[in-house]
């Protein structure tokens, strides 16, 4: 169990011509607030389910109007992280679905004006426990950068936050240096001691004793940068161990380049050598290419080979929007006829007809009366689907099968006596009254 | 797409209440709005009561301020609206309706994609 965080740092108009001023128009006041969507990104996801991993909103945004004329200012943001709680494991990879919604105040036509001005979508991978990771997105003319991180919660501890490390009533059980580890409780495990000297920041082991070095860097404890050639530094004192000069404290020194950048020395500075995905003067930008995954639902990435060139998603069938993330509503546009019910079964549409029609949508009308017999002289009226018998007299039913009573509704008037009859009724009228049915 | 269905409507006396539910199925993730419109017969269609899923803000129609009261349960897939003081001219066909929509204006029903068939209140003096 942990959380996922997500801190926005700014959200506005993107470099470059077109961008809009601010999100609010000058007439009406608006704030903005954000939700956030995770899913697993190595799973493909069901689009019903788009956050298996959790969602969250923030709160609202201070109310922003606007002033023409005057320089657009930052927009105010809302406060605090946005946080996502997570049950089960970490997943490591994970695809995320930033929406960026604007609620517009004041009085018009329709009422309050809600819109979703941007959404951003990527996939990440990001072990638990890590630092934050800084990302730069653009949707449109807007561009948001924010922070994340997925952090454990206590029991839980490492990289998935799978295992439990629980602290015990009675430490003293377990020997110096070894903690007390859930679910065994008279279990104690070691922590994991990496050689000695180490680099903390360049090294990190997996087994007791090795020191191994991330990118970007070298040597038996990880304090050399790759770009520094073999006892040819000219700074520091020299090693007992190698004859060489360790170097001293220079511009790479405690690696200022940010997710797995390698550091090489510049005659005024340095350089980082970013990993696919990220640049910047410290690879502290994330650019969204199409190694990223950004197309979801079977969407297929075009261009984009690298962060500064823009990506294309070409949807499926039933999917929209820049990610493929949004589901068409095919049943939207009516393609059923003559009542038919639409179901969007994703793969396909489905019409499901009224009774009388028939065809993929429903475009075919039946001859209800087709193979139907009106019994005793009926003949078949067609319409509405169904088929109807209109009976000849002195019978009814729906196949008028049935032999009608016709005195059964009190035809004769003013207290006449109504006698069957095999062409029909005969009306013996009161004294006084006469006609067909007694009416005069 | 989201498929609707309301219960609920009937006859009354002024002054009397009724509760209408209308539960959403299908890809409900999805919903931005859900609300109630309600037309009488020769009038226009009326936007009566609506919450906002996305933010669970609600907002009336000023003829039934301070009368009804909208609301939804924790799985966000059903609303229902509470008639309290009902008048003869609450009388009409009560429609569900639900947007998916990007952009929406909450009393405009060109903003929402889904619509249930109706339920009808009908309030006698």
């Known amino acids: 169990a942990g959380v996922f965080e997500l801190q926005i740092h700014s959200f506005g108009p993107g470099p470059g011509p077109g961008a809009p001023r601010s999100p609010c128009s000058a007439r009406l006041p608006c704030r903005l607030f954000f939700r956030v969507c995770l899913k697993p990104g190595l799973s493909e996801e069901a689009a019903e389910s788009p956050c298996a991993l959790g969602a969250a909103l923030s709160a609202r945004g201070p109310v922003y109007t606007e002033q023409p004329g005057a320089p657009a200012p930052d927009l105010p943001l809302p406060d605090g992280l946005l946080q996502v709680p997570f049950r089960d494991a970490w997943p490591g990879t994970f695809s995320f679905i930033i929406e960026t919604w604007r609620e517009e105040l004041g009085d018009q036509i329709g009422g309050p004006a809600w819109s979703l001005l941007a959404r951003v979508a990527g996939r990440r991978r990001l072990a638990a426990g890590g630092p934050w990771a800084r990302d730069i997105q653009r949707a449109g003319a807007w561009e948001l950068r924010f922070s994340y991180r997925a952090r454990c919660e206590p029991p839980a501890v490492g990289t998935a936050c799978t295992r439990l490390c629980r602290p015990r009533s009675a430490p003293s059980r377990c020997g110096p240096g070894l903690r007390p580890c859930a679910p065994l409780e008279d279990e104690c495990e070691a922590p994991l001691v990496c050689r000695a000297g180490c680099s903390p920041e360049h090294g990190f082991c997996e087994q007791p004793g090795e020191c191994r070095c991330l990118e970007g860097w070298t040597g038996p404890l990880c304090t050399v940068p790759v770009s520094t050639s073999s006892c040819l530094s000219p700074r520091g004192p020299s090693s007992a161990t190698t004859g060489c000069l360790v170097p001293g404290p220079g511009p790479c020194d405690g690696n200022p380049c940010a997710n797995g950048g390698s550091c090489s020395e510049t005659p005024r500075s340095f350089e980082c050598t970013c990993p696919r995905g990220f640049y910047g003067l410290r690879c502290e930008v994330s650019g969204v290419t199409c190694a990223d995954g950004p197309c979801f639902n079977g969407g297929l990435c075009v261009g984009g080979a690298d962060p500064d060139s823009a990506y294309i998603c070409h949807c499926p069938p039933g999917f929209q929007g820049s990610n493929c993330e949004k589901r068409v509503d095919r049943c939207s546009l009516q393609p059923c006829r003559n009542g038919g019910l639409c179901l969007d079964l994703g793969h396909a549409l489905r019409c499901r007809c009224r009774a009388g029609f028939a065809g993929p949508r429903c475009e075919h009308d039946l001859d209800d009366c087709a193979g139907r017999a009106c019994a005793n002289g009926g003949t078949c009226v067609e319409g509405g689907g169904a088929h109807r018998c209109s009976c000849a007299l002195g019978f009814g039913g729906r196949d008028c099968r049935e032999r009608a009573d016709p005195c059964a509704a009190r035809p004769c008037a003013h207290g006449g006596r109504c006698y069957a009859h095999f062409s029909g009724l005969v009306c013996a009228c009161a004294p006084g009254y006469m006609g067909a049915r007694c009416e005069f | 797409q989201v498929h609707l269905m309301e219960s609920g409507g009937g006859s009354v006396q002024a002054g009397g209440s009724l509760r209408l539910s209308c539960v959403a199925s299908g890809n409900t993730y999805r919903l931005n709005s859900m609300g109630w419109f309600r037309q009488a017969p020769g009038k226009e269609r009326e936007g009566v009561a609506f919450?906002?899923?996305?933010?669970?803000?609600?907002y009336y129609g000023a003829s039934v301020k301070g009368r009804f009261t909208i609301s939804q349960d924790n799985a966000q897939t059903t609303v229902y609206l509470q008639m309290s003081s009902l008048k003869p001219e609450d009388t009409a066909m009560y429609y569900c309706?639900?947007?998916?929509?990007?952009?929406?204006?909450?009393?405009?029903?060109?903003?929402?994609?889904?619509w249930g068939q109706g339920t009808q209140v009908t309030v006698s003096s």
């Open positions: 309706a639900a947007s998916t929509k990007d952009q929406f204006y909450v009393f405009n029903p060109i903003g929402y994609d889904s």
């Open positions: 919450i906002v899923m996305i933010r669970g803000t609600t």
